[in-house]
């Protein structure tokens, strides 16, 4: 399927130009999306181009500025949050990034009713997390690892926890590993629906080994960054969940929620918390060996002021073929009866589908089915369930939004997005207002992204929120590469691939091939999305063919493919990239002597192993911030797929799957190894060990480090990185500069 039509008129082609590296580094062809900040069923907030915060009412068609850009500018605010009673806005400034999601900031409260900032009992700085209650204008915030509560912004704070300590005890915020690998949030506290209770997690990292690395900065002596970071097999954080009554916080204080007995019997994780009502909460727990998950529904006991989690309200989810869930264990979406819920998990055929659980998981009613996967449940209302899947036309890399009518019997299914802008839009997400009265659809491609507003009852499009007209105009004179998404059938395995072809692609000619790989468990690279990025430039200007292949271990094509890599990372992911390359060579337009592979993070691991596979297929390759041994990576992630690095578990494969073990095999390839020295995620240690092994084996290679840069290699490092990699590839492919 050719997703980007080539332009055929010669007169047009003369005025058109190829993409430049500068275009990419400057973000010239970046797109915009529009996600309404919903504040009711029919109202949303949006920050206008001139930085005013504007409230839009869909039904009246009216809009007005609720917060002036003058106010935003007076505190250099980069973000805002309106209290549910609409009386206050918090303004966030002095943003200081910590890890992937976490950051600290200074918060100011603006009183909308009085038209001024709140003075008195001001918030301390910097704050680690702050949020409004779901009703009214209570504030919960985390400062120096402790949680505080304010009944009103101008009131003195009530301190909920007192044991918070840097790198030791975390209250209301996750430690490093929970943030990155379990919660995927900067917070670990949750208001009940009407703000009566506040639940929070306490993480005790006292016994966790610490990763230490130098941060060079500008001082005479570098400083040392210390992070409690459990690597595979190491001591893990100890988690406890507490709930406090925010109306009378001093009355009984925080009450601990009991852990299910079958979970508490060995090392375990807390995976998520979902409030059902003000007096019912659902907690999800996971054994350290991550194939057993327990969903526990707990009720408030007024008489004892405690939380009761009866065994009859424990639901077990177990995988016999891999780990529990996909990347994470899915979260429940409760229905209006406040006890039954909808949840995505594997059906008997090994495809992730929506199930309705009323009493037990064994009696779950399957809502969706087929050789495709349900991906996300967006919203459940009294009569409809909205979800996304990759069912349409059997393309796993698409996302369409569906509505199932659950109010009628039998339930009927309707694809909301499949035929809206079929050529332009095949990959959607959605954002719903209260009660799904209205929703926004955000289409990511394959054409230029577009965001639209829709009526939640009729699905009628109301208006276009963002259509990227400037981008469309800017691209009119650009020779974009052609993209196609197809599949290879090899030994009963389907390998979907995306091929990016030079604008004047001619099948009778030979082109250099670059494989871009990620390949991590439950990832997906072959997606029908729009992008003008580095590989677009390599195809457009440098005449390369770029291919992305989803092999075994990747997501949304069933458990057989997903769990194939269970307990043996680094084998099939690499094999499948190699198999695909061989198939591409058979297509006749690839120059066999000019094939390269590159990847970042997990992709750096796969590209390194592919280069060291001894096949002779690859002339050169690049690994950016690669994992080199699973013993060096985080426990939560690694053990999910690999088990423990112990003799009686999976130590042997931990040892066999390192990049260092294959150092000798790099002798006949050109290898560029790149890493940031301040990578908190995939530690520089990984590349240091690869480099040491290559030196010890007397194998020549190229390397680049980025001082004080983390896993993202951002800012000026990005420009340097892509320029450097471009030179490396052009040299490898004998392309003139």
């Amino acid at each position: 399927i050719v997703l980007r039509p080539s332009r055929v008129h010669n007169s047009e082609e003369n005025t058109m130009r190829a993409l430049t590296l500068k275009d990419i580094l400057n973000g010239t062809f970046s797109y915009k999306t529009f996600f309404p900040n919903w504040i009711s069923g029919q109202e949303y907030l949006h920050q206008s181009a001139d930085n005013n915060i504007v409230l839009y009412n869909i039904e009246t068609g009216q809009s007005y500025t609720i917060l002036s850009n003058r106010t935003m500018k007076s505190v250099n605010a980069s973000n805002y949050g309106l209290s549910p009673d609409r009386q206050f806005v918090y303004l966030e400034s002095d943003y200081s990034k910590l890890w992937r999601y976490s950051y600290t900031a200074t918060y100011y409260i603006y009183d909308l009713s009085n038209g001024e900032f709140v003075r008195g009992n001001e918030l301390p700085r910097p704050i680690q997390y702050l949020c409004w209650s779901p009703v009214g204008s209570k504030l919960a915030y985390v400062y120096q690892n402790n949680i505080y509560l304010k009944q009103r912004p101008g009131d003195p704070p009530f301190q909920i926890t007192f044991n918070g300590r840097e790198n030791k005890i975390f209250n209301g915020i996750p430690d490093w590993v929970y943030e990155e690998e379990m919660l995927a949030t900067k917070y670990a506290l949750w208001w009940s629906p009407n703000g009566k209770f506040l639940a929070y997690a306490e993480f005790n990292d006292t016994d966790i080994p610490v990763i230490a690395y130098s941060y060079y900065g500008d001082e005479q002596y570098p400083r040392t960054i210390n992070i409690p970071y459990p690597k595979a097999g190491a001591k893990n954080p100890v988690v406890r969940i507490f709930i406090i009554d925010t109306t009378y916080p001093a009355y009984v204080g925080p009450q601990e929620v009991p852990v299910p007995a079958m979970i508490a019997s060995s090392d375990y994780y807390f995976s998520w918390l979902t409030w059902v009502t003000d007096e019912r909460v659902c907690l999800q727990w996971l054994k350290r060996v991550q194939n057993v998950s327990v969903l526990s529904i707990c009720d408030f006991r007024e008489d004892w002021q405690t939380w009761d989690c009866p065994k009859t309200q424990e639901h077990i989810e177990e995988s016999r073929t891999g780990w529990a869930g996909g990347f994470f264990v899915s979260t429940p979406v409760f229905s209006y009866d406040a006890i039954s819920y909808y949840k995505i998990f594997s059906d008997k055929d090994g495809y992730k589908h929506i199930h309705y659980i009323k009493d037990t998981v064994e009696n779950a009613i399957q809502i969706t089915s087929g050789k495709w996967e349900a991906i996300n449940i967006f919203r459940v209302t009294q009569d409809s369930l909205f979800y996304s899947s990759n069912e349409f036309e059997e393309y796993p890399g698409r996302r369409n939004i569906y509505r199932i009518s659950i109010g009628s019997y039998p339930p009927s299914k309707k694809c909301v997005t499949c035929h809206l802008r079929k050529e332009r839009c095949q990959y959607y997400t959605a954002s719903f207002s209260d009660y799904a009265k209205y929703y926004a659809l955000v289409c990511y491609g394959p054409g230029i992204p577009i965001s639209t507003l829709h009526d939640g009852r009729t699905d009628q499009e109301i208006k276009i929120l963002e259509e990227n007209k400037e981008l469309e105009n800017a691209l009119k004179n650009i020779q974009l590469p052609k993209e196609e998404i197809k599949k290879l059938e090899v030994d009963e395995i389907t390998l979907w691939y995306k091929m990016i072809l030079p604008p004047q692609f001619d099948r009778s000619k030979k082109y250099p091939l670059l494989i871009q790989v990620y390949g991590g468990p439950c990832s997906q690279s072959v997606r029908s999305v729009f992008a003008v990025n580095w590989i677009s430039y390599l195809a457009s200007k440098e005449g390369m063919v770029i291919a992305l292949v989803d092999g075994r271990g990747t997501a949304f094509q069933g458990d057989k493919l997903l769990y194939a890599v269970y307990r043996k990372l680094g084998v099939y992911e690499v094999e499948d990239q190699i198999t695909a390359v061989r198939k591409f060579i058979e297509m006749g337009f690839i120059d066999e002597k000019r094939i390269a592979i590159w990847g970042w993070s997990y992709g750096g691991y796969v590209s390194s192993l592919a280069l060291a596979s001894g096949t002779g297929l690859f002339k050169c390759g690049i690994a950016v911030a690669p994992v080199s041994s699973w013993e060096y990576y985080a426990s939560v992630y690694t053990e999910r797929f690999m088990g423990l690095p112990t003799k009686d578990d999976n130590l042997e494969h931990y040892k066999n799957s390192t990049v260092m073990a294959r150092a000798e095999y790099f002798r006949n390839v050109d290898y560029l190894l790149i890493h940031g020295t301040a990578d908190d995620n995939v530690h520089f240690q990984n590349s240091a060990q690869i480099a040491k092994a290559l030196v010890n084996a007397q194998v020549d290679f190229q390397a680049m480090w980025y001082s004080d840069q983390n896993h993202g290699l951002s800012g000026l490092s990005t420009n340097h990185l892509y320029t450097h990699m471009t030179h490396f590839l052009k040299q490898c492919f004998s392309l003139s500069d």
């Epitope: 500025t65 609720i66 007076s74 101008g154």
Partner: antibody, heavy 124, light 113 residues
Framework: QVQLVQSGAEVKKPGASVKVSCKTS????????IHWVRQAPGQRLEWIGG????????NYNQKFKGRVTITVDTSASTAYMELSSLRSEDTAVYYC?????????????????WGQGTLVTVSS | DIVMTQSPDSLAVSLGERATINCKSS????????????LAWYQQKPGQPPKLLIF???TRESGVPDRFSGSGFGTDFTLTISSLQAEDVAVYYC?????????FGQGTKVEIK
């Protein structure tokens, strides 16, 4: 000259409601919040509440919460204060006053112009 | 709530003499980040609404005679009429606008001795 003109005196029975208006002119209505202050005979001035005309969001003194409703009609540049469940101790002169909106963090303003006052008498 | 207490309750001063009114707040009205005190002084004559004289504790409202001055910071404030005139006979109120609810002092009645 800035003007805040209030509605006339009212006599009400206990348990009834009263609605006082405050018509403003000769300034940009949306640049100022409107506040209501009362003064019972021989008593100090007492703040009842205020409203921001830009968004219609009121803020009430907890003492009056549940009994007072402050609204605005931006098109008429007029603010209203309604007090319900009147009792004899609500007998007072009720004033509206304007207060400049503080857009900036380093701002904060006093009430610079006041209405002439409306006498509300609560008597059976 | 911030409680405002004025002293004296009433004051009789000869024409041309200095009149001094004190106002004490139950908590500081000094906004440290701005170094501004959120205190205002009003003058109210019989049958009239209050009139703003001073804001930010010491800044005179435009059109207010310079015989009126305000001073103080934190919790203790003073309004001074340097040379009392006949038209200055009125009740004077201090008011804090540091936080809500806005509160006023009980008032000081200034008369001519």
């Amino acid at each position: 000259q800035v003007q805040l003109v209030q509605s006339g005196a009212e006599v009400k029975k206990p348990g009834a409601s009263v609605k006082v208006s405050c018509k403003t002119s000769r300034y940009t209505f949306t640049e100022y919040t409107i506040h209501w202050v009362r003064q019972a005979p021989g008593q100090r001035l007492e703040w009842i509440g205020g409203i921001n005309p830009n968004n219609g969001i009121p803020n009430y003194n907890q003492k009056f919460k549940g009994r007072v409703t402050i609204t605005v009609d931006t098109s008429a540049s007029t603010a209203y204060m309604e007090l319900s469940s009147l009792r004899s101790e609500d007998t007072a002169v009720y004033y509206c006053a304007r207060r400049r909106i503080a857009y900036g963090y380093d701002e904060g303003h006093a009430m610079d112009y006041w209405g002439q006052g409306t006498l509300v008498t609560v008597s059976s | 709530d911030i409680v405002m207490t004025q002293s004296p309750d009433s004051l009789a001063v000869s024409l041309g003499e200095r009149a001094t009114i004190n106002c004490k707040s139950s908590q500081s009205l000094l906004y440290s980040r701005q170094q501004k005190n959120y205190l205002a002084w009003y003058q109210q004559k019989p049958g009239q609404p209050p009139k703003l004289l001073i804001f930010w504790a010491s800044t005179r409202e435009s059109g207010v005679p310079d015989r009126f001055s305000g001073s103080g910071f934190g919790t203790d404030f003073t309004l001074t009429i340097s040379s009392l005139q006949a038209e200055d006979v009125a009740v004077y109120y201090c008011q804090q606008y540091f936080s809500y609810p806005l509160t006023f002092g009980q008032g000081t009645k200034v008369e001519i001795k």
